[in-house]
Amino acid sequence: SSSPTSSASSFSSSAPFLASAVSAQPPLPDQCPALCECSEAARTVKCVNRNLTEVPTDLPAYVRNLFLTGNQLAVLPAGAFARRPPLAELAALNLSGSRLDEVRAGAFEHLPSLRQLDLSHNPLADLSPFAFSGSNASVSAPSPLVELILNHIVPPEDERQNRSFEGMVVAALLAGRALQGLRRLELASNHFLYLPRDVLAQLPSLRHLDLSNNSLVSLTYVSFRNLTHLESLHLEDNALKVLHNGTLAELQGLPHIRVFLDNNPWVCDCHMADMVTWLKETEVVQGKDRLTCAYPEKMRNRVLLELNSADLDCDPILPPSLQTS
């Protein structure tokens, strides 16, 4: 992923007992929040592995890169980063691994320059549909976000609400059409069983999409047609059995796409014939020579590119009178 990185060489660290300023008060120019390290030269603040339970109120106005990783934030309320004056320069915000289980509507409001957000490795049981759009209007003001990293945000099974986790995430991505400018979206390691059909059509600027290490079985109802700018599509380590003609044609039609398909349990029967033919001709798939069959048993570990139509048969379906129990 592309989490914010820092070129800072010298950080000033505040004393642990420094009292936090009230968010309504502008922080002193050189103030650094308690339990954080600050580098004005690098415009970077790091509050890392400090078990913070809330976002510091006295963040310096100069901050461009903010690391709040490895904390215990639990909830991001509306306006969690709203300050007077606003954090107008904040461009990269990393909240990964901070035990967030709830991100409320408008949590990232008043961050006009926020281009990169990483919420990975948080068990997000409750992600508001308006977490990124900030309002429940049918069309919101465009979000400045360009990169959104949401790897491994699936909560444990017993903490999930009575709704589809995929649906909850997609609702947040689509609300108010605020994320039309998004160019990188990472959704790896989230146990996704399916991809709701609307999601990609409304993210037309995507250049990089990572859906690796999920449990996707099929892409039959997913349309890639509008993703003219898509350059990388990571589908490694899913549960894909075959890609059908419609999907193959759409991927082939994207001018810059490179698709990664390693470690899927490909089923090498008669339904695989079109995909094998396509694989032999396409330059779209990276490492296509590594793709192997998982089923049926007799085909296990066979290389897809080495198969021909005679290899790809389906067991005949016997009429009921001839079937054995």
Epitope: S2, S113, R115, V146, E147, G181, R183, R184, S205, R207, H208, H229, E231, S232, P255, H256, I257, R258, E283, V284
Partner: antibody
């Protein structure tokens, strides 16, 4: 980093192939571009090759200039044909950011002189 | 063809004073903000200063800032330093159904008054 080579003196009507060797990153993972600068003049975009090999050119460069890439050698090429005196310039190769459409890494350039 | 017009062609500013360079494109850049600024010193390749219209590249001093959207953009140096003497170029990125196109402005030579 990227480093251009292959420049030199060539006669009008001649051809030349410039190379750009990349190190520290995989060329196939990035869009790469060629930009030139005539002596004492401004920058002029020539064309670009996308990660999967699609190419786009400035209208004046179409037909005479061709961008290609050899992933196994991690090298970018610019083939220039039917060269004219006005093609005399420093030729730069530049890497395009993976998210933004901006040139974030430049070589030092190689000088091409077209003269009889 | 797309034309990018920079103004002025040259500019002389006193040390510590503000310098402003404008860039106008004949068409809107991609997503209204795919506009970059570069600094070039004699004998060197261009150096990226600002991308996405207003985002400062890594290691670039805070006195540089960019603004604008669509077709009109501005580069500002809030307090000119001696090391800022250089030629500055804007560059736009464009997309149409037929593909990608990039264009540079003609450059602005910045000197000390």
């Amino acid at each position: 980093s990227v480093e251009e080579s292959g420049g030199g003196l060539v006669q009008p009507g001649g051809s030349l192939r410039l190379s750009c060797a990349a190190s520290g990153f995989s060329l196939s993972s990035y869009w790469m571009s060629w930009v030139r600068q005539a002596p004492g003049k401004g920058l002029e975009w020539i064309g670009i090759i996308a990660g999967r090999g699609s190419t786009y050119y400035a209208s004046w460069a179409k037909g005479r200039f061709t961008i290609s890439r050899d992933n196994s050698k991690n090298t970018l090429y610019l083939q220039m044909n039917s060269l004219r005196a006005e093609d005399t310039a420093v030729y730069y190769c530049a890497r395009v950011s993976s998210i933004y459409y901006t040139f974030n890494l430049w070589g030092q350039g190689t000088l091409v002189t077209v003269s009889s | 063809d797309i034309v990018m017009t920079q103004s002025p062609d040259s500019l002389a500013v006193s040390l510590g004073e503000r310098a402003t360079i404008n860039c106008q494109s004949s068409q809107s850049v991609y997503s209204n903000n795919e506009l970059s600024w570069y600094q070039q010193k004699p004998g060197q390749p261009p150096k990226l200063l600002i991308y996405y219209a207003s985002t400062l590249a890594s290691g670039v001093p805070d006195r540089f800032s960019g603004s604008g959207s669509g077709t009109d953009f501005t580069l500002t140096i809030s307090s000119l330093q001696a090391e800022d003497v250089a030629v500055y170029y804007c560059q736009g990125s464009y997309y149409s159904g037929s593909g990608w196109y990039y264009a540079f402005g003609g450059g602005t030579k910045l000197e000390i008054k």
